[in-house]
């Protein structure tokens, strides 16, 4: 089942899925000046069985030179966007990812793909958190979140991670710092851009990956 919401936002932290469960959708989005072809796939789908999973459908973008615009449509200039984006590079795969049955790897980029990837997760999906550069982790528990089904509704577990500035004084043991929820999200906006760098798979952030920088948006 698709998860209704997105993984929780932790101040000064990013999250990433290391593998995608079957049923995960990745919207076919194109970069500026390009559009999804009319009869092209709407999304890629992680599909398969417990022994082998792969991405079904192919995203295709075509030049939108003959763009159909109206006065009312005002494409947002980059600086107007609510969140900054980075150019997407081919993400590096964690070595152990392929051994996860019923999961897909990060799909390869397609020609003229948008800089943001929009995923729709399914129940059972796990994402991992890491503090952004310039912040360090104070752990109370696992720095991960799982989409779970409870009483017919989906919810994400709360990752036990606080990211504090390098220059900030460390908290004393046992001192509770309130877990701030994201503020100022218009109309219950449930999107989150993720830029990952040196993302660690393990909760303890011990095993590091090669740097991969890309941007993802969830719902």
């Amino acid at each position: 089942e698709l998860c209704d919401d997105d993984p929780p936002e932790i101040p000064h932290a990013t999250f990433k899925a290391m593998a995608y469960k079957e049923g995960t959708m990745l919207n076919c989005e194109c970069k500026r000046g390009f559009r999804r072809i009319k009869s092209g796939s709407l999304y890629m789908l992680c599909t398969g069985n417990s022994s082998h999973s792969s991405w079904d459908n192919q995203c295709q973008c075509t030049s939108s030179a003959t763009r159909n615009t109206t006065k009312q449509v005002t494409p947002q200039p980059e600086e107007q966007k609510e969140r900054k984006t980075t150019e997407m590079q081919s993400p590096m795969q964690p070595v152990d990812q392929a051994s996860l049955p019923g999961h897909c790897r990060e799909p390869p980029p397609w020609e003229n793909e948008a800089t943001e990837r929009i995923y729709h997760f399914v129940v059972g999906q796990m994402v991992y958190y890491q503090c952004v550069q310039g912040y360090r982790a104070l752990h109370r528990g696992p720095a991960e979140s799982v989409c779970k089904m409870t009483h017919g509704k989906t919810r994400w577990t709360q990752p036990q991670l606080i990211c504090t500035g390098e220059m900030e004084t460390s908290q004393f043991p046992g001192e509770e710092k309130p877990q701030a929820s994201p503020e100022g999200r218009p109309e219950s906006e449930t999107s989150c851009l993720v830029t990952t760098t040196d993302f660690q798979i393990q909760t303890e952030m011990a095993a590091t990956m090669e740097t991969s920088i890309f941007t993802t948006e969830y719902q």
């Epitope: 919207n27 109206t70 494409p75």
Partner: antibody, heavy 114, light 107 residues
Framework: QVQLQQSGAELVRPGTSVKISCKAS????????LGWIKQRPGHGLEWIGD????????NYNEKFKGKATLTADTSSSTAYMQLSSLTSEDSAVYFC???????WGQGTSLTVSS | DIQMTQSQKFMSTSVGDRVSVTCKAS??????VAWYQQKPGQSPKALIY???YRYSGVPDRFTGSGSGTDFTLTISNVQSEDLAEYFC?????????FGGGTKLEIK
Amino acid sequence: QVQLQQSGAELVRPGTSVKISCKASGYTFTNYWLGWIKQRPGHGLEWIGDIYPGGGYTNYNEKFKGKATLTADTSSSTAYMQLSSLTSEDSAVYFCARVTPASWGQGTSLTVSS
Amino acid sequence: DIQMTQSQKFMSTSVGDRVSVTCKASQNVGTNVAWYQQKPGQSPKALIYSASYRYSGVPDRFTGSGSGTDFTLTISNVQSEDLAEYFCQQYNSYPYTFGGGTKLEIK
């Protein structure tokens, strides 16, 4: 929670035009295709066309070209469908829907009558 | 345009029964098929995407299957609240098209 709130029922004269609105909330309006669907008793559901608000790109079902015009206002996260040269054949319930993952508005009833 | 044919306009079933609604595409649409439930006076609600995957909040008694041209929505252990019309839709080729609908009646 994804929500699509459509404008109220319309009673209009033949030969005129009407503009139906669909206000989106709970997701990034500019990042998703939004479609329009016609439902008439005995005629089932018909896909009119769809629009990508982030770029103003549109697709139309050939059957509705010249009849429907799709637009979007990103500042208010609202999509519009204008229907022109109305006849009794245009009397129907019209739905807006986020294309994928699918989520539909409550529908707008249009009655064309003199 | 691709035609989606739901041959049974009406189906009668009893609470607790298992019922299968079928849909046939006029050409191969892969698994790019969705199923919707529409209750009287309401808008369609998405149940299934990609032929067999359930949307959030959809009870697991609803199961989608099929690929290519033949698709089935199975409702096991039918409940009184399942009284509705069910539509299939293909989104493999533009324009996206719907089946004519199957009305489920509870005996």
